[in-house]
């Protein structure tokens, strides 16, 4: 029995920050587990991760440098990134394992969804023009 | 057949650290379905919990001795391991490790255990 | 934490008896119709071993006379007719929150 996870399939940062929403076919209310998010096809990065327990505050962190938030809905926890760079343009994996009460449940791999990060445009300052066209 | 075999136990000085290892056969430790958990015995007192590692490799520990404790495997060896710092006397023990699966998490079979003796 | 707390501490009793070792749990330990509570004996020296799983279920090799009931917050072990090797110290668990706890055990003694 496994837990389906649905995803957008691309999303675009423009201003370097980003909300992926990870839903889930599951009701994570009063069940303790790990919520977290992987970069890369081979999902080799661990970006954020989530600890849900009935009873404390939500626990978000990140062992890789990404700066990253975490927020929960009954089906959903959803990853607020920051600060991303161009070249972290890549697929993200959003993964669930409910550890309390057993049995355990993991999520059927989803589809990812392709965070693709546009840089800052600067625009030209007034004083400085862009060079004009002949 | 299914067996644990911890080792690694000994004298340890206070404030010292342990390394213990649990040597699994019979099952993978990366193969869902199951996962391993440390738990200790003082001396005459009862059984104590740990923590635990899932097939994945996520853990979970015992609130008590969250920032003390870490458990790790190596796949290639199918061990487990657990590293315990700051060490006190109240660490003395025997440490077992136990399997359990995943449907009810009872612990179904059990290494023989370690003792660790904490003193100076 | 879920506490769990069993009774009698310690017992004494004779080759034949019935024996009955209580546990009740600080809070429920039930979810969907199965209750988290497993029971374990262990003797001087030796590794605990598994009895009662899910409150009710006998582990493989346990012999018949060991018997385990309840449901929620009030759990028992029976032995209905004690053996030579029963003499031992049993445990009971809670494995439906973590820390996962064990209840402080009942040493059965032989009178």
């Known amino acids: 029995n496994k837990i389906l996870v649905k995803q957008s399939p691309m999303l675009v940062a423009y201003d370097n920050a980003v909300n992926l929403s990870c839903k889930y076919s599951y009701n994570l209310f009063s069940r303790e587990f790990r919520a977290s998010l992987h970069k890369g096809l081979d999902s080799a990065v661990e970006v954020c991760v989530v600890y849900g327990n009935y009873s404390q505050q939500l626990q978000v962190y990140s062992k890789t440098g990404f700066n990253c938030d975490g927020k929960l809905g009954n089906e959903s926890v959803t990853f607020y990134l920051q600060n991303l760079y161009v070249n972290q343009t890549d697929i993200y994996f959003c993964k669930i394992e409910v550890m309390y009460p057993p049995p355990y449940l993991d999520n059927e791999k989803s589809n990812g969804t392709i965070i693709h990060v546009k840089g800052k445009h600067l625009c030209p300052s007034p004083l400085f023009p862009g060079p004009s066209k002949p | 057949e299914v067996q644990l075999v911890e080792s690694g136990g000994g004298l340890v000085q206070p404030g010292g650290s342990l390394r213990l290892s649990c040597a699994a056969s019979?099952?993978?430790?990366?193969?869902?379905?199951?996962?391993v958990s440390w738990i200790r015995q003082a001396p005459g007192k009862g059984l104590e919990w740990i923590g635990e590692i899932y097939h994945s490799g996520s853990t979970y520990y015992s609130p008590s001795l969250k920032s003390r404790v870490t458990i790790s495997r190596d796949n290639s060896k199918n061990t487990l391991y657990l590293q315990l710092n700051s060490l006190r006397a109240e660490d003395t023990a025997v440490y077992y490790c136990?399997?359990?699966?995943?449907?009810?998490?009872?612990?179904?079979?059990w290494g023989q255990g370690t003792l660790v003796t904490v003193s100076s | 934490d879920i506490q769990l707390t069993q009774s009698p501490s310690s017992l004494s009793a004779s080759v034949g008896d019935r024996v009955t070792i209580t546990c009740r749990a600080s809070q429920s330990v039930d979810f969907h119709g199965i209750s988290f509570l497993h029971w374990y004996q262990q003797k001087p020296g030796k590794a605990p071993k598994l009895l009662i799983y899910?409150?009710?279920s006998l582990q493989s090799g346990v012999p018949s006379r060991f018997s385990g009931s309840g449901s929620g917050t009030d759990f028992t072990l029976t032995i209905s007719s004690l053996q030579p090797e029963d003499f031992a110290t049993y445990y009971c668990q809670q494995s439906y929150r973590s820390p996962r706890t064990f209840g402080q055990g009942t040493k059965v003694e032989i009178k």
């Open positions: 899910a409150a009710s």
């Open positions: 136990a399997r359990y699966e995943y449907y009810h998490y009872d612990f179904d079979y």
């Open positions: 019979g099952f993978s430790l990366s193969t869902g379905g199951v996962g």
